[in-house]
């Protein structure tokens, strides 16, 4: 009889074991274990009748296809075999064990005791068959195994072979190289690769297989396993396989598809091809006069580009438009995209006008082409060129007027300061007692008229100022303070300020330049109670043109010392010039007595200590701060007075021979102007130079409106 066994382990014994087995007995045990396992069988006891080649009693171990072993007897001889310590393994998951005894036993045999168990099959080491083994990596587990692939590969649906994803390869360059995956290593199995060469219409692609060509083939059937097929337009070429590469292929198409297919077996190196695209040739471009072409090639074909440029000093001219370079391209029909342009000499054109300056042409016929020269100069003596440059400009290769210092920037004509066109006389009497100034002696002198219509009744007064540049007037802060009924500092509205320049006689303003104010700037720290920081600026609405009667004064260098004691300075103004009129009379009477003609006086700077002491000795608040200095004579007689306020106290700088505004008429003691030991007090301008530039916007040529020590 047959016993079916399905357990993972078990015991098999001869009938009656451990007693002797019966005669004429046959039992078959069929052991089945799950797939992925094999059966291990071994015997703990074996005692059967001996016979030649186990003819009588035996134990036979077999599978469906083969007998694995036949055992009999008590011990192994030449003609019979006992299992002893031998272990029998089934190749698969099935094993059949048959016990047979013949009709007679000469003596008592105890039979056998066997054990079996299911053991795991290591498919990874045992699989020899390529059809079943893993392509790349094999992983064994109890009862089975699985396959995986190297990086970049995908497991095929057969769960065994490794393929690649290679269907999205598009080549758009004019030349290139295409290979089978992993070349020159064997290409992957079970893969379908698709390569596209896609170029612009007008190109023709040619293919050339190189070096190694190794695709699995068959001796009888053309390329049944792996192959390359090439599709170009309507043509299909191939399939190609084997070890002989196809001849070079001219596809005559701008679009080529290459299909490479591999099956699930074989180890072949693959292939490599290079492709190149060619197009229609264009005629050699003609070299323009004074020009060059890049790149220089023996031939030019479709899509080739050339860049036309010109020699230094020349410009490419195309359709009346000047440019640095011009590019043309060879078209698919073998013609150039454009006609070759010409080269035209660079022309800088008419040079830009220079404000307050002139232009002189150094080249004949007033040429403005490459390497021509011009010279800018400033209107002398009222303006000078910033940085003292030569003013020579050359027409550059780029068609731009260039100066070796300023480059393409224009020069700047800055006002010349402190140099009146008439030189100031040596001996000067006083403003008090009267000495008329000649027109043009004080070209920086400004008359500032304030008509404050916000006051009730309207208030009108005047003061002096000094021109610092075409747009700025320097004056005293108290001149531009609203004449309030309290001690607060409020600047007058700019609408209420009029400035006269180039004025000589106030009765005749026709020859003067009058300007309204764009801005009134009082020093933020101006103190109404002691006139400390008595300095201000007026920005003119329009820049004034300079000339013999309108020229700026220079600013000093920023030095806290101010002018040296005993130095002589000049002050001009239209203030009180009649010594018989007292200040109090003017203040009490509504009239503002003026000198009709500009007056001036020469005064020495008084040592600071002497001046300070002379004022401290008086009753009242007469402090002379470090932002002030005094000028005048101990004996009196010469002085500035009411109405001269804000005018510049100017000193001639020995080194530069230019007049410098060292002071501004600020205040004087309670006694009448020109009284004995009553010095005029002036704002020390050198303490405010930085503040002034800050307000005016520091010009590039600071040194041209400021005398440096």
């Amino acid at each position: 009889h047959t016993v079916e066994l399905n357990n993972m382990f078990g015991q098999i014994q001869s009938p009656g074991y451990p007693d002797s087995y019966p005669s004429d007995s046959e039992v078959t045990w069929n052991i089945t274990v799950p797939e992925g396992f094999r059966i291990k069988l071994y015997f703990m006891h074996f005692n059967l009748e001996s016979s030649y080649l186990c003819e009588y009693d035996y134990v036979k171990v077999e599978t469906e296809e083969q007998v694995l072993a036949t055992f009999c007897g008590r011990e192994t001889t030449d003609t019979e075999q006992t299992p002893g310590q031998e272990v029998v393994f089934s190749p698969g998951s099935f094993m059949s064990i048959t016990f047979r005894s013949d009709f007679s036993n000469e003596e008592r045999f105890t039979g056998f005791d066997a054990h079996y168990m299911a053991v795991d099959v290591d498919e990874c080491t045992e699989r020899e068959d390529e059809e079943l083994s893993c392509d790349h990596y094999c992983h064994n587990y109890i009862g089975g195994y699985y396959c995986s692939c190297r990086f970049g590969y995908l497991l095929h649906t057969d769960n065994r072979t490794c393929r690649v994803e290679c269907s999205d390869n598009v080549y758009t360059q004019r030349t290139g190289v295409i290979t089978s995956p992993d070349f020159p290593n064997p290409y992957p199995k079970s893969s379908e690769c698709f390569y596209t060469i896609e170029l612009e219409e007008g190109f023709m692609v040619s293919l050339q297989f190189e070096d190694i060509f190794d695709i699995e083939d068959h001796p009888e059937v053309p390329c049944p396993y792996d192959y390359i097929k090439i599709k170009a337009g309507p043509k299909v070429l191939g399939p190609f396989c084997g070890e002989k590469a196809p001849e070079p292929i001219n596809t005559e198409s701008h679009s080529v598809q290459i299909l490479f297919r591999s099956d699930n077996s074989g180890e072949n190196q693959g292939w490599r091809l290079s492709y190149r695209a060619t197009g229609n040739e264009c005629p050699d471009p003609e070299l323009p006069v004074h020009g060059k072409i890049e790149p220089l090639q023996a031939t030019y074909s479709f899509k080739d580009q050339v860049l036309i440029s010109c020699d230094t000093g020349y410009k490419v001219l195309k359709d009346n438009v000047e440019m640095d370079t011009f590019q043309i391209e060879c078209l698919k029909d073998g013609t150039w995209s454009n006609r070759i342009p010409t080269c035209k000499i660079a022309d800088c054109g008419a040079p830009a006008e220079l404000k307050h300056g002139l232009i002189t042409f150094s080249t004949r016929n007033n040429l403005t082409t490459y390497k021509s020269e011009i010279q800018y100069s400033c209107q002398q003596p009222y303006y000078k060129m910033l940085h003292n440059i030569t003013g020579v400009y050359t027409c550059s290769a780029q068609g731009v007027w260039m100066n070796e210092v300023l480059g393409r920037s224009q020069p700047t004509c800055l006002p010349v300061c402190g140099q009146p066109s008439r030189s100031l006389p040596n001996l000067v009497k006083r403003i008090i007692g009267g000495r008329n100034a000649e027109p043009g002696l004080f070209p920086w002198q400004a008359l500032i008229v304030v008509e404050d219509t916000s006051r009730v009744p309207n208030d009108k007064w005047f003061g002096s100022g000094a021109l610092l540049s075409e747009s700025w007037i320097l004056t005293a802060a108290h001149v531009l303070r609203s004449q309030r009924r309290d001690n607060t500092v409020t600047p007058v509205s700019k609408e209420h300020v009029t400035v006269y320049l180039g004025l000589h006689d106030v009765r005749d303003k026709s020859g003067a330049v009058n300007s309204s104010a764009a801005q009134v700037v009082l020093h933020p720290d101006f103190n109404i109670q002691n006139y400390n920081h008595d300095i201000a600026l007026v920005q003119l609405r329009e820049p004034v043109p300079l000339g013999p009667h309108v020229m700026p004064i220079c600013l000093p260098s920023p030095e806290p010392e101010g002018p040296e004691p005993h130095m002589l300075g000049l002050v001009a103004g239209w203030g009180i010039s009649n010594p018989n009129v007292t200040v109090d009379e003017i203040i009490s009477s509504g009239t503002r007595t003026l000198s009709d003609v500009l007056q001036y006086v020469k005064l020495p700077v008084v040592p600071y200590a002497e001046c300070k002491t002379s004022y401290e000795s008086r009753s009242g608040n007469y402090s002379v701060t470090e932002n002030m200095f005094c000028a005048g004579y101990y004996e009196g007689g010469k002085d500035t007075c009411l109405g001269d306020s804000g005018g510049a106290f100017v000193i001639l700088d020995d080194l530069s021979q230019r007049w410098v505004a060292q002071g501004l008429v600020s205040w004087g003691g309670p006694e009448e102007c020109g009284s004995k030991q009553v010095y005029g007090v002036y704002t020390k301008v050198s303490n405010y130079v930085d503040w002034l530039w800050e307000q005016m916007g520091s010009p590039q040529g600071l040194g041209d409106l400021q005398v440096e020590r």
Epitope: S454, V456, R485, D486, T488, S493, Y531, D584, G620, P670
Partner: antibody
Framework: QVQLKQSGPELVKPGASVKLSCKAS????????INWVKQRPGQGLEWIGW????????KYNDKFKDKATLTVDTSSNTAYMDLHSLTSEDSAVYFC???????WGQGTLVAVSS | DIVMTQSPSSLAVSAGEKVTMTCKSS????????????LAWYQQKPGQSPKLLIY???TRESGVPDRFTGSGSGTDFSLTISSVQAEDLAVYYC????????FGGGTKLEIK
């Protein structure tokens, strides 16, 4: 002609705040400051502070620094005074003046009572 | 702070009489630079707003009758009404504007 028109009388509770207004017309509002003056019933004048509409500068009498806040709205030519944390001591007529006291408002009576 | 003291605090005069009232400041109101005294006089009639009469100690505001005269310098100032009229019944205040503003306590003028 120049006019300063002040807001109407106010009856407020102690601890509350009040905002008085002074609308100017007939001159350029930004050319001069607006002064505020307090007068308690039967008493003299006390200067509170001024504001300059051109740049919003203010000056206060130290006594009123924490009591009053001065502001302006140049678009409506109006000056305002906020009085805070009112007590019976703040009951008074409040005047505004401009163009250096040439023109005065008619005054606003503020009565502080619970 | 500058303190302003007015005297007398009140006075009664008949119409047509001359009257002078004074105002003292605790410090000089003369600005030595502008040469101005920063003192003003105001008139406040019953139930009305104050009215500016004099500024800079002696400058008469436009429209003010010339019977009103201001004088003085430094710390001592006075307001004189040369011939008192019935409509001059009012309280008169001085005010300094040398350093911020301070009013005097006022002088009450009554007509007999």
């Amino acid at each position: 002609q120049v006019q300063l028109k002040q807001s109407g009388p106010e009856l407020v509770k102690p601890g509350a705040s009040v905002k008085l207004s002074c609308k100017a017309s007939g001159y350029t509002f930004t050319t001069d400051d607006i002064n505020w003056v307090k007068q308690r019933p039967g008493q003299g004048l006390e200067w509170i502070g001024w504001i300059y509409p051109r740049d919003d500068r203010t000056k206060y009498n130290d006594k009123f620094k924490d009591k009053a806040t001065l502001t302006v709205d140049t678009s409506s030519n109006t000056a305002y005074m906020d009085l805070h944390s009112l007590t019976s001591e703040d009951s008074a007529v409040y005047f505004c003046s401009s163009l250096e006291d040439t023109y005065w408002g008619q005054g606003t009576l503020v009565a502080v009572s619970s | 702070d500058i303190v302003m003291t007015q005297s007398p605090s009140s006075l009664a005069v008949s119409a047509g009489e001359k009257v002078t009232m004074t105002c003292k400041s605790s410090q000089s109101l003369l600005n030595s630079r502008t040469r101005k005294n920063y003192l003003a006089w105001y008139q406040q009639k019953p139930g009305q707003s104050p009215k500016l009469l004099i500024y800079w100690a002696s400058t008469r505001e436009s429209g003010v009758p010339d019977r009103f005269t201001g004088s003085g310098s430094g710390t001592d100032f006075s307001l004189t009404i040369s011939s008192v009229q019935a409509e001059d019944l009012a309280v008169y205040y001085c005010k300094q504007s040398y350093n911020l503003y301070t009013f005097g306590g006022g002088t009450k003028l009554e007509i007999k």
